[in-house]
């Protein structure tokens, strides 16, 4: 998997003529249509409600730091998080909640109730996802909060819990 | 949030040479790669099965009118709707349904059953989403229908119920 | 619905000057920003865990063969599958599972438990989706596996069960 950032951003390239002026492939490779994306899987060992992620996932034009995706190029981003829960039902219902935070503020949340029958069962699977389309500035942080993080099964389902962002439209 | 339309669409710009011919940034800013998108939150007060939306959300190259997103540029669109339900369980199961309509025709729906134990409980959360990838023409309408709209909690969860579209590929 | 592939790919076009050099629309239509996408609905009659799809859906720059989407252009793809289940509850809970496979390897799965009360009910609806962002090479296959395929309701919900991919960023 590539984990490259964007060392040679179009911003660093002189955009006028020169030897490139007639070479359309050259021209278009220098085009101001930046693309940035990330696709990270949850860290193996979770010990707090703010989720941590494996930084060896796909990172391109986005940084990862202390549980946060950090935006490097401003624009309109599509953000999506998907989590796989495995709940050993107690004798009451359980509310699973996924919060998407932008700069430590709650931007969007998803909730689902499981174990609603109130019966102690072997296990119940639940999948929960949340998406967001939002303008993000440089250094904006994107993070995920899950109160019931103990129900995120990172051992059986290490690939199922992901946070992904991609730039849809830059703000040039 | 920006709610700009596209007053200076590339269609209105002469695409031949002139003073712009050597300025690559100028050339590429006039490129025929339109982008259109919308991200609207549900209106506070719902009183019918066809959902209404807050028109002060993100709208770019898409219009909002009478519960409909109205397409302004033809192309292949990604459409996604996500709803957060809060159900005060009666003593029977409840089927929650989300319908995506294109030009008033049901194009795709999602259903989930809650309160299946038949026990009257305090409340049950359920999150439901639906997506679509489709070619849309100019003036095509996109709308959402929910039979059980009374269970959409717009007061506690005003940000959780959204309809979003974005143009993936225009039809040039 | 259009089901065109890409007969005149930019790769086959000489990208230097000529009569096109001053015509920016012409230049940009030859740009190396390939787009590939697919949106297929599940086949009417399912008889095995590997799902089959209607090949008369939307296919552009992607082939369909024997239950697989076959990638024709390398790059970073967004892959999403959504399934609508209708379960006649037995007297035990049922685990529904959706697996996304890349080259016959399980890349990501989603699970949800229904009928958890253990009561035999008339029916229970459940909607399950799964997404993936991944680099795919030419001839990579994308497929979907569902252990409980008998619960996918293709008659009542022929449009609700879909597999979709689209190229986010090519690997030029």
């Amino acid at each position: 998997q590539r984990t490259d950032s964007i060392p040679n951003s179009p911003d660093n390239i002189p955009l006028r003529g020169g030897n490139c002026s007639e070479d359309l492939l050259c021209i278009l490779k220098r085009a101001p249509f930046k693309k940035s994306w990330a696709y990270l899987q949850v860290a193996k060992h979770l010990n707090k409600t703010k989720l941590s992620w494996n930084k060896d996932g796909i990172l391109h034009g986005v940084r990862y730091q202390d549980g946060n995706l950090v935006i490097q190029f401003p624009g309109l981003y599509f953000i999506i998080c998907q989590l796989q829960f495995l709940v050993q039902c107690p004798n009451n219902s359980v509310d699973l909640k996924l919060e998407l935070l932008i700069n430590k503020h709650i931007k969007k949340q998803a909730l689902v109730t499981v174990c609603e029958s109130g019966m102690q069962t072997k296990h119940v699977y639940q999948n929960l996802s949340q998406f967001l389309l939002d303008y993000l500035q440089v250094n904006t942080t994107v993070s995920v909060n899950v109160d019931t993080f103990q129900y995120i099964d990172t051992s059986t389902f290490p690939l199922e819990n992901v946070l992904s962002v991609f730039l849809y439209s830059n703000s040039d | 949030q920006r709610t700009d339309s596209i007053p200076n669409s590339p269609d209105n710009i002469p695409l031949r040479g002139g003073n712009c011919s050597e300025d690559l940034l100028c050339i590429l800013k006039r490129a025929p790669f339109k982008k259109s998108w919308a991200y609207l939150q549900v209106a506070k007060h719902l009183n019918k099965t066809k959902l209404s939306w807050n028109k002060d959300g993100i709208l770019h190259g898409v219009r909002y009118q009478d519960g409909n997103l109205v397409i302004q540029f033809p192309g292949l669109y990604f459409i996604i709707c996500q709803l957060q339900f809060l159900v005060q369980c009666p003593n029977n199961s409840v089927d929650l349904k989300l319908e995506l309509l294109i030009n008033k025709h049901i194009k795709k729906q999602a259903l989930v059953t809650v309160c299946e134990s038949g026990m009257q409980t305090k409340h049950v959360y359920q999150n439901l989403s639906q997506f679509l990838l489709d070619y849309l023409q100019v003036n095509t309408t996109v709308s959402v229908n929910v039979d059980t709209f009374q269970y959409i909690d717009t007061s506690t969860f005003p940000l959780e119920n959204v309809l979003s579209v974005f143009l993936y590929s225009n039809s040039d | 619905q259009r089901t065109d592939s890409i007969p005149n790919s930019p790769d086959n076009i000489p990208l230097r000057g000529g009569n096109c050099s001053e015509d920016l629309l012409c230049i940009l239509k030859r740009a190396p920003f390939k787009k590939s996408w697919a949106y297929l609905q599940v086949a009417k009659h399912l008889n095995k865990t590997k799902l089959s799809w209607n090949k008369d859906g939307i296919l552009h720059g992607v082939r369909y063969q024997d239950g697989n989407l076959v990638i024709q252009f390398p790059g970073l793809y967004f892959i999403i599958c959504q399934l609508q289940f209708l379960v006649q509850c037995p007297n035990n809970s049922v685990d529904l599972k959706l697996e996304l496979l890349i080259n016959k390897h399980i890349k990501k799965q989603a699970l949800v438990t229904v009928c958890e009360s253990g009561m035999q009910t008339k029916h229970v609806y459940q909607n399950l989706s799964q997404f993936l962002l991944d680099y795919l090479q030419v001839n990579t296959t994308v497929s979907v596996n569902v252990d409980t395929f008998q619960y996918i309701d293709t008659s009542t919900f022929p449009l609700e069960n879909v597999l979709s991919v689209f190229l986010y960023s090519n690997s030029d």
């Epitope: 935070l101 430590k104 709650i106 909060n145 | 809060l86 005060q88 409340h123 940000l159 | -």
Partner: antibody, heavy 124, light 110 residues
Framework: QVQLQESGPGLVKPSETLSLTCTVS????????WTWIRQPAGKGLEWIGR???????NYNPSLKSRVTMSVDTSKNQFSLKLSSVTAADTAVYYC??????????????????WGQGTTVTVSS | QSALTQPASVSGSPGQSITISCTGT?????????VSWYQQHPDKAPKLMIF???NRPSGVSNRFSGSNSGNTASLTISGLQAEDEADYYC??????????FGGGTKLTVL
């Protein structure tokens, strides 16, 4: 201007249930979280829980098994029940309003309106 | 949920600045920018002074300001005045959709 007034018995016997009501005047009860907070004499504030007009509740985990809150929008009132009380539940009980606004994100404006408090003593 | 940690007391002379700290965990103060500060005079109900870390409600003096770093929030009062003498409580929203208060700090104006 919104005002809150707590009411209920000032004395409750151990093992019984403490019941308090808060009446909201000068404004609507809709679109806010309504909160109960207590303060034992000479000690700090303790958050008990909150209820939204939709009926959604959040309770302090340490009190959750004993707390029930309800809201009556027609009377502009909300109430607190605390079961199986002991002397440790003796305190001044405040009802209060918490303002949360969902706009471009969730804005938490804190507890901006308080009742004057009512003293509840648990004793036999 | 454990109470947030505040110093039991702080003091300062009129005109000086003082800072009250409030230490929590990664599930409250460290997680959200949802920290509030309250002032309570003897035998009175508390009054909201700061919300969302550093925002003042209308009517609150701009001598009051807040900040947040890691798992610790702070309230700073500049140009200390006699009427600032009171108890101060921090409060943070938590990951379980609840609120938690600090133990309180008694401010003495010398």
């Amino acid at each position: 201007q919104v005002q809150l007034q707590e009411s209920g018995p000032g004395l409750v016997k151990p093992s019984e249930t403490l019941s308090l009501t808060c009446t909201v005047s000068g404004g609507s009860i809709s679109s806010y979280y309504w909160t109960w907070i207590r303060q034992p004499a000479g000690k700090g504030l303790e958050w008990i829980g909150r209820i939204y007009t939709s009926g959604i509740t959040n309770y302090n985990p340490s009190l959750k098994s004993r707390v029930t809150m309800s809201v009556d929008t027609s009377k502009n009132q909300f109430s607190l029940k605390l079961s199986s009380v002991t002397a440790a539940d003796t305190a001044v009980y405040y009802c209060a309003r918490e303002r949360v606004v969902g706009a471009s994100r969730y804005y938490y404006y804190g507890v901006d309106v308080w009742g004057q408090g009512t003293t509840v003593t648990v004793s036999s | 949920q454990s109470a947030l940690t505040q110093p039991a007391s702080v003091s300062g002379s009129p005109g000086q600045s003082i800072t009250i700290s409030c230490t929590g965990t990664s599930s409250d103060v460290g997680l959200y920018n949802y920290v509030s500060w309250y002032q309570q005079h003897p035998d009175k109900a508390p009054k909201l002074m700061i919300f969302e870390v550093n925002n003042r409600p209308s009517g609150v003096s701009n001598r009051f300001s807040g900040s947040n770093s890691g798992n610790t929030a702070s309230l700073t009062i500049s140009g200390l005045q006699a009427e600032d003498e009171a108890d101060y409580y921090c409060s943070s929203y938590t990951s379980s959709s609840t609120w938690v208060f600090g133990g309180g700090t008694k401010l003495t104006v010398l």
